[in-house]
């Protein structure tokens, strides 16, 4: 029960997050403009990452798209590129994630294969929240760089007569949505790894040795491990629960191969 | 068509108040920001105050600050302007205009109102 | 604040002449953001109330006539009218609609001769 609620509040936190993810990618106010020393302005700037956007006081509008490709700086390529990759990722591992998910059955599926599924999910879901988080703090870096420069330009063009206002940008709501957005995501990945660990199915499981008449070479493995004669194909690939409750120190003691996170 | 109609003006005394009302009419008053704008006799244009379409923003002339107060009643389409502590120097016609086109152009004007100040 | 200066105070031309007149702006009315000068011409006849006539520094509002052109970037505009005609007798002021508060010039008379 713990499993299946896992599993799907890692889904729906990844949902969320992916959601963050594209509207933070869509959203036009990556960068806006700093009001701090024109507080009254009556033009305002902000830009996202395919736009540029100017709002009027009057109320009117006007967006212009970033036409070039080759004219724009690496950073916003990267920045660009980064997103895409997290919303792809996320998108891939919340089409894997349905299909993992304990609460559906499809077909005869097994349970080791909607744990790897989960498994995968789970990745896919932390590198895709982590590309979200990158793409963010890079744009982020990108803008604390500019604004200390066109600081500096400023106050240092003050002589003349005429003073040009120059528009410094700081940030928009488009980066708060992205790192929380990318934060869920990632949250989400971790809930699906940890689900995972849970739908796995356990190996054979015994606390004592196994006896057979007429075994020689019995294999004695503590807790946790396969007990198998070496004769006989009926016992090969025969999986045996325990049914008994484990404690924590044993799980730890002897993890699965599900464990490697 | 658009029309804006100011009314309130009149003789007010030095020191005293006075409320200047705008009905506008023939577009979706709620969408835009209004200005007022005075002309004093034989002088130039001098813009006084400007409304956001919901109140969010408004700003004053240095000239008027602290003395008038900007409004407006958007369901019944109209703008105020509360003016306290008239000065001679406030005797002007007054204008309420929009901001209905781009580049903040004042596109539409009212026909203004009169205000004098005098003793 | 913004401060308009327009020159001359006032100008007399015979009608079709072509005339010019300036308006210096204290700071830069340029938005980086969209490329665009955010100064506006008005014209005002005796009598009349306020018109507007050019926005952005050059763009001419519909159904102004052509012979109106404005020019200029960041802090020096220019209203021209190319061959003046009667009706164009009025007061042009230049404003700013960059910041608050949205200050105007004092005003160029046209007088006819």
């Known amino acids: 029960m713990a499993v299946t609620a896992c599993q799907g509040l890692g889904f729906v936190v990844s949902l969320i997050g992916i959601a963050g993810i594209i509207a933070a990618t869509c959203m036009d106010q990556w960068s806006t403009q700093d009001l701090y020393n024109n507080p009254v302005t009556a033009v305002f700037n902000y830009q996202g990452l395919w736009r540029s956007c100017v709002r009027e006081s009057s109320g009117f509008t006007e967006c212009r798209g970033y036409f070039t490709l080759l004219g724009l700086p690496a950073m916003l390529q990267a920045v660009r590129a980064l997103m895409i990759v997290g919303i792809v990722l996320g998108a891939i591992g919340l089409l894997v994630s349905i299909f993992a998910l304990k609460c559906i059955r499809i077909g005869s599926m097994e349970d080791s294969a909607k744990a790897n599924m989960t498994l995968t999910s789970g990745i896919m879901f932390i590198v895709s929240g982590l590309c979200a988080i990158a793409g963010v703090s890079v744009f982020a870096n990108m803008l604390v760089t500019n604004f200390w420069m066109s600081t500096a330009n400023m106050y240092t063009g003050m002589g003349g007569m005429v003073q040009t206002v120059q528009t410094r940008y700081t940030f928009g709501a488009a980066l708060f949505v992205g790192w929380v957005a990318g934060g869920l995501t990632l949250i989400g990945g971790v809930m699906m790894c940890i689900a995972c660990r849970g739908l796995a199915p356990e190996e054979t499981n015994y606390k004592a040795v196994s006896y057979h008449a007429s075994g020689h070479s019995v294999a004695y493995k503590p807790g946790g491990f396969k007990a198998s004669t070496g004769f006989g194909s009926n016992t090969k690939n025969k999986k045996i629960y325990d049914g008994g409750a484990r404690t924590e120190d044993e799980v730890q003691s002897y993890p699965s191969k599900h464990d490697y996170v | 068509d658009v029309q804006l109609v100011e009314s309130g003006g009149g003789l007010v005394q030095p020191g005293g108040s006075r409320k200047l009302s705008c009905a506008a009419s023939g577009f979706t008053f709620s969408s835009f920001g209004m200005h007022w704008v005075r002309q004093a006799p034989e002088k130039g244009l001098e813009w006084v105050a400007y409304?956001?379409?919901?109140?969010?923003?408004?700003y004053y002339a240095d000239t008027v600050k602290g003395r008038f107060t900007l409004s407006r009643d958007n369901p019944k389409n109209t703008l105020f302007l509360q003016m306290t502590s008239l000065r001679s120097e406030d005797t002007a016609i007054y204008y309420c205009?929009?901001?209905?086109?781009?580049?903040?152009?004042?596109?539409?004007w009212g026909q203004g109102t009169s205000v004098t100040v005098s003793s | 604040d913004v401060v308009l200066t327009q020159s001359p105070s006032s100008l007399t031309v015979t009608e079709g002449e072509k005339v010019s007149m300036s308006c210096k702006s204290s700071q830069s009315l340029f938005n980086l953001g969209n490329q665009k000068n955010y100064l506006t011409w008005y014209q005002q006849k005796p009598g009349q109330t306020p018109t507007l006539l050019i926005y952005?520094?050059?763009t001419r509002k519909s159904g102004v006539p052509d012979r109106f052109t404005g020019s200029g970037s960041g802090t020096d505009f220019t209203l021209t009218i190319n061959t003046v005609q009667a009706e164009d007798l009025a007061v042009y002021y230049c404003?700013?609609?960059?910041?608050?508060?949205?200050?105007f010039g004092a005003g160029t008379k046209l007088d006819l001769k």
């Open positions: 952005w520094a050059s």
């Open positions: 205009a929009t901001s209905y086109y781009y580049g903040n152009a004042l596109e539409y």
């Open positions: 409304i956001s379409s919901g109140s969010g923003s408004i």
């Open positions: 404003q700013n609609v960059y910041s608050y508060p949205l200050t």
